[in-house]
């Protein structure tokens, strides 16, 4: 990536890292308003299976692994990107490496959920306080999960699907920060590991993933009021290990693996019309990216 200053624009969709033949160090940003891509400062270490989030206007890259010709190293790293300076800086590492991690943000704190270290599949969860640059373990999930989708709704943290080391999962659970406890919620209609999970209009969406046999293009959403999962329109492409985010009331899914190819496709879901459309292509196909949107 280039080392010049990032243009000062509105909300951008950032995609960090990923995998194509090896873990990648790219940081790129898509501007939905004009359809352009920006090439930004590379991650200091290549990584795939990471997660991205934004706190206080800064982009954080959490966990993952560096799968390269030289070896394969799971990551406990937390790195912070400042869009104003186009620079990465390291933060305090997590207590354990977490590849194929999920993250969510509540009250400015980053929750790192599950993931794997070698053949260990974590149920542990830890919380990062940016002001103190410290991680602290919180209550573990009821289930070990890697390739877990994480979303925050109404200050509750949801962990959806994933892989427990033996089975791909359709189960989901919810973390209550005030009680420091997890509770199971209604299971999805579909087993999904490596799905894209996000929140839109008071619903949790789970898009794509892998059911243990095939990549999926189906999408379902959870209504917290009725505690039910309902299918919505499927994506055009089957994909697992995809990136997902919400921008101006629409869901964007980025890349992933369809069982044959590493996708460069970016699709956008409009909840008003219940339709998916291809909006752009990434500069190259990849899976296992970390994605987040900058705040205004």
């Amino acid at each position: 990536g280039s080392m010049g200053h990032a243009p000062k624009v509105g909300r951008l969709i950032y995609t960090a890292g990923g995998y194509f033949r090896q873990s990648l160090s790219y940081l790129e940003a898509y501007n939905p308003s004009d359809g352009t891509w920006l090439d930004l400062a590379d991650l200091q270490v290549p990584r795939s299976g990471l997660a991205g989030c934004v706190v206080g206007g800064l982009l954080y890259a959490v966990g993952g692994r560096n799968n390269s010709p030289d070896g394969n190293t799971d990551s406990s790293a937390l790195d912070c990107y400042n869009p104003m300076t186009n620079q990465w800086s390291p933060c305090a590492p997590m207590s354990v490496p977490r590849n194929r991690i999920g993250v969510g943000v509540i009250d400015g704190h980053i929750y790192a959920v599950g993931g794997s270290h070698g053949c260990i599949h974590h149920n542990s969860v830890e919380r990062y306080e940016p002001e103190r640059d410290e991680w602290h373990l919180v209550a573990p999930m009821l289930t070990r999960r890697i390739g877990v989708g994480v979303a925050v709704l109404n200050r509750l943290l949801y962990a959806v699907g994933g892989f427990d080391g033996t089975n791909r999962l359709n189960s989901a659970e919810c973390y209550y920060p005030e009680r420091n406890e997890w509770r199971m919620i209604t299971a999805m209609n579909t087993i999904r590991s490596g799905a894209g999970v996000c929140v839109l209009h008071n619903c949790i969406y789970a898009a794509g993933g892998y059911d243990g046999q095939d990549q999926l293009n189906s999408v379902e959403r959870y209504d917290v009021e009725t505690e039910t999962w309902t299918f919505v329109a499927p994506m055009k492409h089957r994909r697992s290990a995809l990136g997902i985010t919400v921008h101006q009331g629409r869901i964007y899914v980025l890349g992933g693996y369809d069982g044959h190819t590493f996708l460069d496709s970016v699709e956008c879901y409009d909840p008003d019309t219940d339709t998916w459309s291809e909006v752009t292509r990434m500069t190259s196909g990849r899976s296992g990216v970390g994605v987040a949107v900058t705040m205004e």
Partner: antibody, heavy 118, light 107 residues
Framework: EVQLVESGGGLVQPGGSLRLSCAAS????????IHWVRQAPGKGLEWVAS????????LYAKSVAGRFTISADTSKNTAYLQMNSLRAEDTAVYYC???????????WGQGTLVTVSS | DIQMTQSPSSLSASVGDRVTITCRAS??????VAWYQQKPGKAPKLLIY???SLYSGVPSRFSGSRSGTDFTLTISSLQPEDFATYYC?????????FGQGTKVEIK
């Protein structure tokens, strides 16, 4: 019945290339990670490469990284090992194996012999 | 890389004997160890996974155990068809590594 059948082995000169195939039946290769393991004549087993069906990520032993490429064609239910820049020390019987979630190879092919010699 | 040191490299035993083969990991591998049996000219066959779980269809005379980083394969009463080479394998961390093998021969 689960079966794995390797093919494509043979005699090749140093620096040459071969492509091994592993045809699966009785299960979908999209449902398990597929691994290649080799065994030099009179020696032990050495893990070579693997492919993850969920993320598409591949892993390689240091001894073959940059020279070998593992891939899978789910429509043909077949995995492949493309071997380039072959060396005498790559001479071995190459096995493909299915590795379910719990990390041990429960089914193996019969093996195919690769001989690298001038 | 994690080394799996297997011992003995060979042993001679009679039918009916109790046979024990050990693998020591150079660092912690949790219980992510498997044992395989291989006969000449044939592919390996899985016997034990996750250190102590007997694979489906494998006779109950085979068992596996773990003590820290030491892993043991035991054949409680050796049968004629058990004369073969046995390998341990760790899948705890990349790269997966095998022991050098133990050849069980007829005394």
């Amino acid at each position: 019945e689960v079966q794995l059948v390797e093919s494509g082995g043979g005699l090749v000169q140093p620096g040459g290339s071969l492509r091994l195939s592993c045809a699966a039946s009785g299960f979908a290769i999209s449902a398990s990670s597929i691994h290649w393991v080799r065994q030099a004549p009179g020696k032990g087993l050495e893990w070579v490469a693997s492919i993850d069906p969920e993320t598409g990520e591949t892993l390689y032993a240091k001894s073959v990284a940059g020279r070998f490429t593992i891939s899978a064609d789910t429509s043909k239910n077949t995995a492949y090992l493309q071997m380039n820049s072959l060396r005498a020390e790559d001479t071995a019987v190459y096995y493909c194996a299915r590795m379910p979630a719990w990390g041990s190879a429960d089914y193996w092919g019969q093996g195919t012999l690769v001989t690298v010699s001038s | 890389d994690i080394q799996m040191t297997q011992s003995p490299s060979s042993l001679s035993a009679s039918v009916g004997d109790r046979v024990t083969i050990t693998c020591r990991a150079s660092q912690s591998v949790s219980s992510a160890v498997a044992w395989y049996q291989q006969k000449p000219g044939k592919a390996p066959k899985l016997l034990i996974y996750s250190a102590s779980s007997l694979y489906s269809g494998v006779p109950s005379r085979f068992s596996g155990s773990r003590s820290g980083t030491d892993f043991t394969l035991t054949i409680s009463s050796l049968q004629p068809e058990d004369f073969a080479t046995y390998y341990c394998q760790q899948s705890y961390s990349f790269p997966s590594t095998f022991g050098q093998g133990t050849k069980v021969e007829i005394k």
